[in-house]
């Protein structure tokens, strides 16, 4: 089975690498534009230059192309705590990231939010905080992990998952409550 190709891919595959087929004349292969530029006019004939123009400020192309317009530069999302790591240039999009001691949580493929790395108070660091993953904490005895923080077992209700981890403490509390004063 031949994999289905889009019209653009079909047209490009007829020409050697680095060239594309002229949209009005499929016997002509035009040279693609370099990154940082876009297609202003197709080449007039075989062996003749494609008219490529540099991207304007606020736009870019990151690879060789025959795009009629450059792509708009991304903006870092302040509301998500993002900061600009490197600004947009004609051949590279803006790079956004997080501040020191923060990690990225991806809500979707193209949306991330910056959160502070957990400090593992009342526990120990099992795995250090990384660019895309929070610190992994191991809690001390008498504490359980809730929303990546070590919380005292005194806050563990019977209905919660923590009962397994806090079982001895819960038994002790129950024992204390049950024992009457003599």
């Amino acid at each position: 089975l031949v994999p289905h190709l889009g019209d653009r891919e079909k047209r490009d595959s007829v020409c050697p690498q680095g060239k594309y087929i002229h949209p009005q004349n499929n016997s002509i292969c035009c040279t693609k534009c370099h990154k940082g530029t876009y297609l202003y006019n197709d080449c007039p004939g075989p062996g003749q230059d494609t008219d490529c123009r540099e991207c304007e400020s606020g736009s870019f192309t990151a690879s060789e192309n025959h795009l009629r317009h450059c792509l708009s530069c991304s903006k870092c999302r302040k509301e998500m705590g993002q900061v600009e790591i490197s600004s947009c240039t004609v051949d590279r999009d803006t790079v956004c990231g997080c501040r020191k001691n923060q990690y990225r949580h991806y809500w979707s493929e193209n949306l991330f939010q910056c959160f502070n790395c957990s400090l593992c108070l009342n526990g120990t660091v099992h795995l250090s905080c990384q660019e895309k993953q929070n610190t992994v904490c191991t809690c001390h005895a008498g504490f359980f992990l809730r929303e990546n923080e070590c919380v005292s077992c005194s806050n563990c209700k019977k209905s919660l998952e923590c009962t397994k981890l806090c079982l001895p403490q819960i038994e002790n509390v129950k024992g204390t409550e049950d024992s009457g004063t003599t």
Partner: nanobody, 119 residues
Framework: EVQLLESGGGLIQPGGSLRLSCAAS????????MVWVRQAPGKGLEWVSH????????YYADSVKGRFTISRDNSKNTLYLQMNSLRAEDTAVYYC????????????RGQGTLVTVSS
């Protein structure tokens, strides 16, 4: 106490429109970035859209871009989601929420409103 109450869901035919509302109370609404998320039957939560405090910066998931519009009225403490050209795959419970601050979970989220797109 933070309260978020969604309304406006219902049964709608493909191609139709709905406007969801979320009435907020118990916090300073104008200080919070607000989010719409949805949960389709048997699926996880999907981030649909968010809007910053002043309504200037918005974000849309690729699946709803060009069809949904998020807005807010800070004087009425209300968040909106205008949904046009609805598709069967938009069927879900829609929740409004405050943008999480401490970690990737929703401390404050409404009870949700069900949107069913079916002919």
């Amino acid at each position: 106490e933070v309260q978020l109450l969604e309304s406006g869901g219902g049964l709608i035919q493909p191609g139709g429109s709905l406007r969801l509302s979320c009435a907020a109370s118990g916090f300073t609404f104008a200080h919070e970035t607000m989010v719409w998320v949805r949960q389709a039957p048997g699926k996880g939560l999907e981030w649909v859209s968010h809007i910053d405090r002043v309504g200037q910066d918005t974000y849309y998931a690729d699946s709803v871009k060009g069809r949904f519009t998020i807005s807010r009225d800070n004087s009425k403490n209300t968040l909106y989601l205008q949904m046009n050209s609805l598709r069967a795959e938009d069927t879900a419970v829609y929740y409004c929420a405050q943008l999480p601050k401490r970690g990737p979970w929703f401390d404050y989220r409404g009870q949700g409103t069900l949107v069913t797109v079916s002919s």
